[in-house]
């Protein structure tokens, strides 16, 4: 067992918008981070994925219960010490997106392009409508590439 000494470690604090805030915290246990002290609070045990602390931990070391995140609205995908779950992503129709995999308590929503929309970047925050061809199609639109159109006056073989 490692000796108890104060060390700095990066620990994830999770806020209610579904976004992580990185804080440098001091831990008493160097091996497994079982004790966590930050913002004047002391947590002994993290909550598992899909749950959050029922309330903030207090200095006197009492251990709040872990309660589930709101199914379909919030999630946490790793063990953490926060009293807040992460907010599920919305797949915004106006950005050409739809839900591919629904949010669960332990996994954020996965979005994809709506039918007849495409996105050619690795991370898709916005999908564009597929081009409609006036003079015929060379290649159909896919989730990752736009339609390729024939030019006016070009012949089909």
């Amino acid at each position: 067992r490692l000796s108890s000494k104060s060390v700095n470690a990066q620990v994830t604090d999770i806020n209610s918008k579904g976004l992580e805030l990185r804080k440098t915290v001091t831990t008493v246990e160097t091996q497994n981070l079982e004790g966590l002290h930050h913002d004047g609070q002391f947590c002994h045990k993290p909550c598992p994925p899909g749950e959050r602390k029922a309330r903030d931990c207090t200095v006197n070391g009492d251990e709040p219960d872990c309660v589930p995140c709101q199914e379909g609205k919030e999630y946490t995908d790793k063990a953490h010490f926060s009293s807040k779950c992460r907010r599920c992503r919305l797949c915004d129709e106006g950005h050409g997106l739809e839900v591919e995999i629904n949010c669960t308590r332990t996994q954020n929503t996965k979005c994809r392009c709506k039918p007849n929309f495409f996105c050619n970047s690795t991370v898709c925050e916005h999908c564009d409508p597929c081009t409609k061809c006036e003079h015929g199609i060379i290649k159909e639109c896919t989730l990752t590439s736009n339609t390729k159109c024939k030019e006016e006056g070009s012949r089909s073989n």
Epitope: S16, K17, L19, L21, K73, G94, E125
Partner: antibody, heavy 121, light 111 residues
């Protein structure tokens, strides 16, 4: 086009309640969360809370819990915000706004014209 | 709560000049390389109007005289060239953490 039309100005006595409506048109009402924002005279805008019209799930700013109640009537594409136990500090313009999500950044792209609520004895 | 402080309080410029509006957050509003900052314009007696979302994305229908930049705790809205119709109050707003908060506003006057 996308539009949010709010109910008219209200004058209320302290202790009373008021219900402000926000009728949406030009888009699928249940596809976008609705936000509510307060603007008191000479104060910065304050986010009050939000509602998901698809299932009436609500999320409030802690400051407005117990003060504001958000509801929707999906058949009428209308969101409501009720303020209870009115006090002079509730005098403000209240806005509804449509929520958008750009990779978990939530923003308000269309706003109602605002409803002035005046609390006066 | 995350506090947003805007400066200057009032800016007075002539048409054609460059307006630089600042918004500083009390803690970072970034996550995973993205900045959760939005900008709105409000004219007297009107509702706010979205200009910029996610720090630098121009809302559809907004002239490209408007641009947003910044990350972490420091953000800027730039208007160039300024036009008479830009006279308004401009608000920044963060959505990195609940409660979502707004700055106190910068008033832009056109000489």
């Amino acid at each position: 086009q996308v539009q949010l039309v709010q109910s008219g100005a209200e004058v209320k006595k302290p202790g009373a309640s008021v219900k402000v409506s926000c009728k949406a048109s030009g888009y699928t009402f249940t596809s976008y969360w609705m936000q509510w924002v307060k603007q008191a005279p000479g104060q910065r805008l304050e986010w009050m809370g939000e509602i998901d019209p698809s299932d009436s799930y609500t999320n409030y700013n802690q400051k407005f819990k117990g003060k504001a109640t958000l509801t929707v009537d999906t058949s009428a594409s209308t969101a409501y915000m009720e303020l209870s136990s009115l006090r002079s500090e509730d005098t403000a313009v209240y806005y509804c706004a449509r929520n958008r999500d750009y990779s978990n950044n939530w923003y308000f792209d269309v706003w109602g014209e605002g409803t002035l609520v005046t609390v006066s004895s | 709560d995350i506090v947003l402080t805007q400066s200057p309080g009032t800016l007075s410029l002539s048409p054609g000049e460059r307006a630089t509006l600042s918004c500083k957050a009390s803690q970072s509003v970034d996550y995973d390389g993205d900045s959760y900052m939005n900008w709105y314009q409000q004219k007297p007696g009107q509702a706010p109007r979205l200009l910029i979302y996610a720090a630098s994305n121009l809302e559809s229908g907004i002239p490209d005289r408007f641009s947003g930049s910044g990350s972490g705790t420091d953000f800027t809205l730039t208007i160039h060239p300024v036009e008479e119709e830009d006279a308004a109050t401009y608000y920044c707003q963060q959505s990195n953490e609940d409660p979502r908060t707004f700055g106190q506003g910068t008033r832009l006057e056109i000489k």
